[in-house]
Amino acid sequence: AVSEHQLLHDKGKSIQDLRRRFFLHHLIAEIHTA
């Protein structure tokens, strides 16, 4: 699982790339994206 902490501290990523990774994780884990 990709934690929010990992994603937000992953330097050099665009905001869309973070959203992209969150959404891909959401499709697998069905975690609410709000």
Epitope: V2, G12, K13, S14, I15, Q16, D17, R19, R20, F22, F23, L24, H25, H26, L27, I28, A29, E30, T33, A34
Partner: antibody, heavy 118, light 116 residues
Framework: QVQLVESGGGVVQPGRSLRLSCAAS????????MSWVRQAPGKGLEWVAT????????YYPDSVKGRFTISRDNSKNTLYLQMNSLRAEDTAVYYC???????????WGQGTLVTVSS | QLVLTQSPSASASLGASVKLTCTLS???????IEWYQQQPEKGPKYVMD???????STGDGIPDRFSGSSSGAERYLTISSLQSEDEADYYC?????????????FGGGTKLTVLG
């Protein structure tokens, strides 16, 4: 290896309905989001629908919202696309695709052709 | 809105290199995109995802002749040592989530011809 096999295509009159199926094998179907992408004859690709691993979340573009419904039966390893109120512009090859943790459409089937014509 | 622009066609000789371009709408210049290959009469195949910094991850079975790079709003797919089987349509695509809605768009595709 990942295998996705679409079926259910054919010729249908405008305004009628059709249900496509995608039989999945070679992976744990219930662990991944799935999508449908279509391609009109001689044209480019268009995303049609996406569903989460357990089926709780679905997503559609405006072009099919309210007419198409994506669903899945994880006990049968099968993805579905229910298409209602079909139009001539829905004529296309319909592909199912599987996500990975890294990308949306990592694996694709060979497609099934839907022709909407009177 | 989110738009991807591709040249309709490209050609290069067998064994040579070719660089295909996908241009994001200016306000989306930082976005990560995906590249897909579609050989004649076949389903599409995932090639790679490509980030704004040029880093990329390739799909299963994609040879290392395929590489990606980025400059501003442009995303490039470079194929070196061209083989006849590289003749195909190449599409870029990009997805985003806005207000809990998902959107995914494809470019119009580039038809690559490998000259004998």
């Amino acid at each position: 290896q990942v295998q996705l096999v679409e079926s259910g295509g054919g010729v249908v009159q405008p305004g009628r309905s059709l249900r496509l199926s995608c039989a999945a094998s070679g992976f744990t179907f219930s662990s991944y989001g799935m999508s449908w992408v279509r391609q009109a004859p001689g044209k480019g690709l268009e995303w049609v629908a996406t569903i989460s691993s357990g089926g709780s979340y679905t997503y559609y573009p405006d072009s099919v919202k309210g007419r198409f419904t994506i669903s899945r039966d994880n006990s049968k390893n099968t993805l579905y696309l229910q298409m209602n109120s079909l139009r001539a512009e829905d004529t296309a090859v319909y592909y199912c695709a599987r996500q990975t943790t890294m990308t949306y459409f990592a694996y694709w089937g060979q497609g099934t052709l839907v022709t909407v014509s009177s | 809105q989110l738009v991807l622009t591709q040249s309709p066609s490209a050609s290069a000789s067998l064994g040579a290199s070719v660089k295909l371009t996908c241009t994001l709408s200016s306000q989306h210049s930082t976005y990560t995109i995906e590249w897909y290959q579609q050989q004649p009469e076949k389903g599409p195949k995932y090639v790679m995802d490509l980030k704004q910094d040029g880093s990329h991850s390739t799909g299963d079975g994609i040879p290392d002749r395929f590489s990606g790079s980025s400059s501003g709003a442009e995303r490039y797919l470079t194929i070196s040592s061209l083989q006849s089987e590289d003749e195909a349509d190449y599409y870029c695509g990009v997805g985003d989530t806005i207000k809990e809605q998902f959107v995914y768009v494809f470019g119009g595709g580039t038809k690559l011809t490998v000259l004998g």
